[in-house]
């Protein structure tokens, strides 16, 4: 009873630094409470971007302070990292977690490449 | 640098009780979960017990459900193990254990022996 | 409950030889680690993913299968490896591991 996560292999943020992709989980049992967590994988360091835990039926919320915004509907949570810069090119993994009820289940997406190219400064007009 | 360190072991009679911790430094405990693992002399690893994040999740091996109680506090950064009604089979090395991001235990402490004897 | 068996319980080889330790679960197992133990240490871990190498492991551990398969290759053992190796199961609770293959000095 493996969990399987998909999500897409490319997504390129728009000029204004945001990126939005899908990640669906095929879930091997009836959770009613999930976690779901968004990584940023860069050489062998693992960080994490944003993480939000939600009722299934409820919206997703994360923190105030959070770079994620995200809506969920079923096994799928649309999310969105907002004020990339290129340094953040990346590999942006999602993480589900099925907390509740037991049993636990992990599952892990491939990883999504965020591509980010800091928009050209204005040229100064006269 | 990670480090965790348990603390709270000895030698205890069957039926009494026990508390263990583990004082976590250099993360976010709090974005973790924490796992206590345990090893009987000379036998292999046992997973005893997890607590999610921000403590409402927690599950337990069913050796010791209903006698052991997993708790944090994220002010402190440290981890607990309540024992109670504690069993000749409890005896063991318990380490705490970090779940890293990616799901194995990438940190563990250097564990604290509990001896339950008469 | 995944139940992992590992093989063979003891492993007698000499440094510089392969060893190569096996671990096969009772059900597919979607998330594999293996973990090195010496006595009177805590456990390590070495790879998790069945096949990634944690921070600061050598590239002389592997590890490869999927399913039910799963095999952690020691290409040429230093004196430092001989230890006891633990596969563990992460996907789902509870949490298993294998009883443990003790890779001895012949």
């Known amino acids: 009873k493996a969990m399987h996560v998909a999500q897409p292999a490319v997504v390129l943020a728009s000029s204004r630094g945001i990126a939005s992709f899908v990640c669906e989980y095929a879930s091997p049992g009836k959770a009613t409470e999930v976690r779901v967590t968004v990584l940023r994988q860069a050489d062998s360091q693992v960080t994490e971007v944003c993480a939000a835990t939600y009722m299934m039926g409820n919206e997703l919320t994360f923190l105030d302070d959070s770079i994620c915004t995200g809506t969920s509907s079923g096994n799928q949570v649309n999310l969105t990292i907002q004020g990339l810069r290129a340094m953040d090119t990346g590999l942006y993994i999602c993480k589900v977690e099925l907390m509740y009820p037991p049993p636990y289940y992990l599952g892990i997406g491939n990883g999504t490449q965020i591509y980010v190219i800091d928009p050209e400064p204005c040229p100064d007009s006269d | 640098q990670v480090q965790l360190v348990e603390s709270g072991g000895g030698v205890v009679q069957p039926g009494r009780s026990l508390r263990l911790s583990c004082a976590a430094s250099?993360?976010?405990?709090?974005?973790?979960?924490m796992h206590w693992v345990r090893q009987a002399p000379g036998k292999g690893l046992e997973w005893v017990a997890v607590?999610?994040?921000?403590?409402?999740?927690?599950f337990y091996a069913d050796s010791v459900k209903g006698r052991f109680t997993i708790s944090s506090d994220n002010s402190k950064n440290t981890l607990y193990l309540q024992m109670n009604s504690l069993r000749a089979e409890d005896t063991a090395v318990y380490y705490c254990?970090?779940?890293?991001?990616?799901?194995?235990?990438?940190?563990w402490g250097q564990g604290t022996l509990v001896t339950v004897s008469s | 409950e995944i139940v992992l068996t590992q093989s063979p319980g003891t492993l007698s080889l000499s440094p510089g030889e392969r060893a190569t330790l096996s671990c096969r679960a009772s059900q597919s197992v979607s998330y594999l680690a293996w973990y090195q133990q010496k006595p009177g240490q805590a456990p390590r871990l070495l790879i998790y993913?069945?096949?990634s190498r944690a921070t600061g492991i050598p590239d002389r551990f592997s590890g490869s299968g999927s399913g039910t398969d799963f095999t952690l290759t020691i290409s040429r053992l230093e004196p430092e490896d001989f230890a006891v190796y633990y596969c563990q199961q992460y996907g789902s609770s509870p949490w298993t591991f294998g009883q443990g293959t003790k890779v001895e000095i012949k």
């Open positions: 607590i999610w994040y921000d403590g409402s999740n927690k």
């Open positions: 250099g993360f976010t405990f709090s974005s973790y979960g």
């Open positions: 254990a970090r779940g890293g991001h990616l799901g194995s235990f990438d940190y």
């Open positions: 993913g069945a096949s």
